[in-house]
């Protein structure tokens, strides 16, 4: 799996999970989230050569097509596979609210 | 939806469905598929600016992060959403076989 256990231990140019810390105020301009101040969102990036963690038959076809036709702009892309939620604290007036925001943290990647 | 009905009628730099015909022999080097000779595989390509058909909360966060931090390499990518199968004919020895290959044709795209 292209997850932290593999990707953070290996220098990998191909599609892999990359660390990314996001500070809500500085990076997104969001002031409404009181806790946490930021979080490890991570992201997916890297090349998708033939058979590198292909998601579907189409992405396998596309990566093979790209190998044989390297001048073509058609190629698979490295995107998130497994995502996890993030628990946040915000206020409505003076009332604190805890909520879980779904699909906020990328745990693994795929070529799609 | 970023499908043929929208994307093939509009000149769109942002994430959209793009036409791609794949000839099995010429483009993939596959000689085992006897029919069809090729098919309309299509592919997804284009920019993923903030809120352009974002797939998840993470891709929305990432596109906003990319807007505020344009020098960063972290940004969502335009990938397939809906896929459809392709019916093929091949031979096992002298016996013709018809089979449906799943997820061979891209019908729409998303920013993920």
């Amino acid at each position: 799996a292209l997850d932290a256990a593999y990707c953070f231990r290996n220098v990998q140019d191909n599609c892999c999970l990359r660390p990314l810390y996001i500070d809500f105020k500085r990076d997104l301009g969001w002031k409404w989230i009181h806790e946490p101040k930021g979080y490890n969102a991570n992201f997916c990036a890297g090349a998708c050569p033939y058979l590198w963690s292909s998601d579907t038959q189409h992405s396998r076809v596309l990566s093979l097509y790209n190998t044989i036709n390297p001048e073509a702009s058609a190629s698979p892309c490295c995107v998130s596979q497994d995502l996890e939620p993030l628990t946040i604290l915000y206020y409505i007036g003076k009332t604190p609210k805890i909520e879980q925001l779904s699909n906020m943290i990328v745990k693994s990647c795929k070529c799609s | 939806a970023l499908d043929a009905a929208y994307c093939f009628r509009n000149v769109q730099d942002n994430c959209c469905l793009r036409p791609l015909y794949i000839d099995f022999k010429r483009d993939l080097g596959w000689k085992w598929i006897h029919e069809p000779k090729g098919y309309n595989a299509n592919f997804c390509a284009g920019a993923c600016p903030y809120l352009w058909s974002s797939d998840t909360q993470h891709s929305r966060v990432l596109s906003l992060y990319n807007t505020i931090n344009p020098e960063a390499s972290a940004s969502p990518c335009c990938v397939s959403q809906d896929l459809e199968p392709l019916t093929i004919l091949y031979y096992i020895g002298k016996t013709p076989k018809i089979e449906q290959l799943s997820n061979m044709i891209v019908k729409s795209c998303k920013c993920s």
Partner: nanobody, 118 residues
């Protein structure tokens, strides 16, 4: 309503001929692979003949090559199977099948009995 209706089956002597027809309705037939399958008692259903749109070459099971001929008339939404030099081992229920080349959609006819016997 989607329908595939076969006709032309029956009893024929060895060496004789039959012409099966399959009329399609309720879908755009020209986008579909047209095939004939058969199933003999106690045996698996087997592909006999097929033709891909728009003008794909016909393909045949080895056991019927040179004796059977598949053809289609997209204007009339019909596929035919001309069966010559029939043998007793051709006895089976013959099914018409249409499946979309690109995308979802598989349809079957109800079947027509072909019996080759003297």
């Amino acid at each position: 309503e989607v329908q595939l209706v076969e006709s032309g089956g029956g009893l024929v002597q060895p060496g004789g001929s039959l012409r099966l027809s399959c009329a399609a309705s309720g879908f755009t037939f020209s986008y579909y692979v047209a095939s004939w399958y058969r199933q003999a008692p106690g045996k698996e259903r087997e592909l006999v003949a097929t033709t891909f749109p728009p003008d794909g070459s016909p393909h045949y099971a080895d056991s019927v090559k040179g004796r059977f001929a598949i053809s289609r008339d997209n204007a009339k939404n019909t596929v035919f199977l001309q069966m010559d030099s029939l043998k007793s081992e051709d006895t089976a229920v013959y099914y018409c099948n249409a499946r979309r080349v690109e995308g979802h959609g598989i349809y079957w006819g109800q079947g027509t009995q072909v019996t080759v016997s003297s």
